[in-house]
Interface confidence: medium
């Protein structure tokens, strides 16, 4: 069952999922000047069986001007830089560490993908929050939100997190302290 709305917004914080429950949809969004191919899938879908989950269907973008360029290749380094790279890389590194039954990892980028990923979460999904760079986390409880079904309606639990000015960004569960680059995540929501 899809969650009716987005996870709660926390001032000066971003959220992301460690892994995505089966049924999660990722919109096939293309960057400006590109569009999804006409015969292409509207979205990618986390699907699978009891032993293995993966993203079904691939997103494909083509130039709005061109008609027949439907190839799908791994983005070149310069193309990847157009994305919010630190955000994506930290998500994918974290996703590589997990293999939860009934969950998918972060999907790899596709050529000419839009800068922001739009996810549609399902009931039971957990997202984790961290303060953006320059803000410190004050925890009163779990810095996470879970989409739950109550009385036939979906709702997200409220994360117990306050982000106050100064110091390093807090880390997501299982994430190593950055060795070389203390950049943290950019100031934008990582998943929607």
């Amino acid at each position: 069952e899809l969650c009716d709305d987005d996870p709660p917004k926390i001032t000066h914080a971003t959220f992301k999922a460690v892994a995505y429950k089966e049924g999660t949809m990722l919109n096939c969004e293309c960057k400006r000047g590109f569009r999804r191919i006409k015969s292409g899938s509207p979205y990618m879908l986390c699907t699978g069986n009891s032993s293995h989950s993966s993203w079904d269907n691939q997103c494909q973008c083509t130039s709005s001007a061109a008609r027949n360029t439907t190839k799908q290749v791994t983005p070149q380094p310069e193309e990847q830089k157009e994305r919010k790279t630190t955000e994506m890389q930290s998500q994918m590194q974290l996703a590589d560490q997990v293999s939860l039954p009934g969950h998918c990892r972060e999907p790899p980028p596709w050529e000419n993908e839009a800068t922001e990923r739009i996810y549609h979460f399902v009931v039971g999904q957990t997202v984790y929050y961290q303060c953006v760079q320059g803000y410190r986390a004050l925890h009163r409880g779990p810095a996470e939100s879970v989409c739950k079904m109550t009385h036939g309606k979906t709702r997200w639990t409220q994360p117990q997190l306050i982000c106050t000015g100064e110091t390093e960004p807090s880390q997501f569960p299982g994430e190593e302290e950055p060795q070389a680059s203390p950049d943290g995540l950019p100031e934008s929501e990582t998943s929607r």
Epitope: D5, R35, S39, S41, I118, H120
Partner: antibody, heavy 118, light 111 residues
Framework: EVQLVQSGAEVKKPGESLKISCKGP????????IAWVRQRPGKGLEWMGI????????RYSPTFEGHVTLSADMSLTTAYLQWSSLRASDTAMYYC???????????WGKGTMVTVSS | QSALTQPASVSGSPGQSITIFCTGT?????????VSWYQQHPGKAPKLMIY???KRPSGVSNRFSGSKSGNTASLTISGLQAEDEADYYC??????????FGGGTQLTVLS
């Protein structure tokens, strides 16, 4: 609870134009695909096409392509189905529906009855 | 793009089980697990009953179940009740990134 609210019934003459609407929720309208489905009196459901309001990408059933146009206005969180020249055979109930997970239509409008008669 | 094939009508007595079949091709039903079933009462909008071949949305009775074999999907309603009397439609995603519905099956619950 997410709802799709459709415009009211219409009575038109053959050759006239028409635009019916389907209003969705403000917070998520531009993130979901909206499909249109026709049901002629006493008949079954026919898939007409689907549109993504986020960028107005539209896909059509071959049966309906060229006869109807799908559009959307994100600022009004509304999807539209329009005809430039109606035929008597367009008389039907028209439903809009949200494309949910697993490629199923999980939320439906109540329908708009279109009657085309001279 | 041909409609999926369903029987025009089926009937059963209260408490019985009935199965509605939906036959397509390898380009729709057989090629994807994206088969869904809808219930429509007279004068009402369709309601999603089964998605992804066999999954039930919350709020749908577990008397409704779905399955698929090859190019044919099926909807089974067990413990038939009077309120199950309605039209039932199958639908599938297709290889051309469109959707197709079945012609519909009228279920009559005999009294």
């Amino acid at each position: 609870e997410v709802q799709l609210v459709q415009s009211g019934a219409e009575v038109k003459k053959p050759g006239e134009s028409l635009k019916i609407s389907c209003k969705g929720p403000e917070y998520s309208f531009n993130r979901y695909w909206i499909a249109w489905v026709r049901q002629r009196p006493g008949k079954g459901l026919e898939w007409m096409g689907i549109i993504y309001p986020g960028d107005s990408d539209a896909r059509y059933s071959p049966t309906f392509e060229g006869h109807v146009t799908l559009s959307a206005d994100m600022s009004l969180t509304t999807a539209y189905l329009q005809w430039s020249s109606l035929r008597a055979s367009d008389t039907a109930m028209y439903y809009c529906a949200r494309l949910g997970s697993y490629y199923a239509f999980d939320i439906w409008g109540k329908g708009t009855m279109v009657t085309v008669s001279s | 793009q041909s409609a999926l094939t369903q029987p025009a009508s089926v009937s059963g007595s209260p408490g019985q089980s009935i199965t509605i079949f939906c036959t397509g091709t390898s380009s729709d039903v057989g090629g994807y697990n994206y088969v869904s079933w809808y219930q429509q009462h007279p004068g009402k909008a369709p309601k999603l009953m089964i998605y992804d071949v066999s999954k039930r949305p919350s709020g749908v009775s577990n008397r409704f179940s779905g399955s698929k074999s090859g190019n044919t999907a099926s909807l089974t309603i067990s413990g038939l009740q009077a309120e199950d009397e309605a039209d039932y439609y199958c639908s599938s995603y297709t290889s051309s990134s469109t959707w197709v519905f079945g012609g519909g099956t009228q279920l009559t619950v005999l009294s």
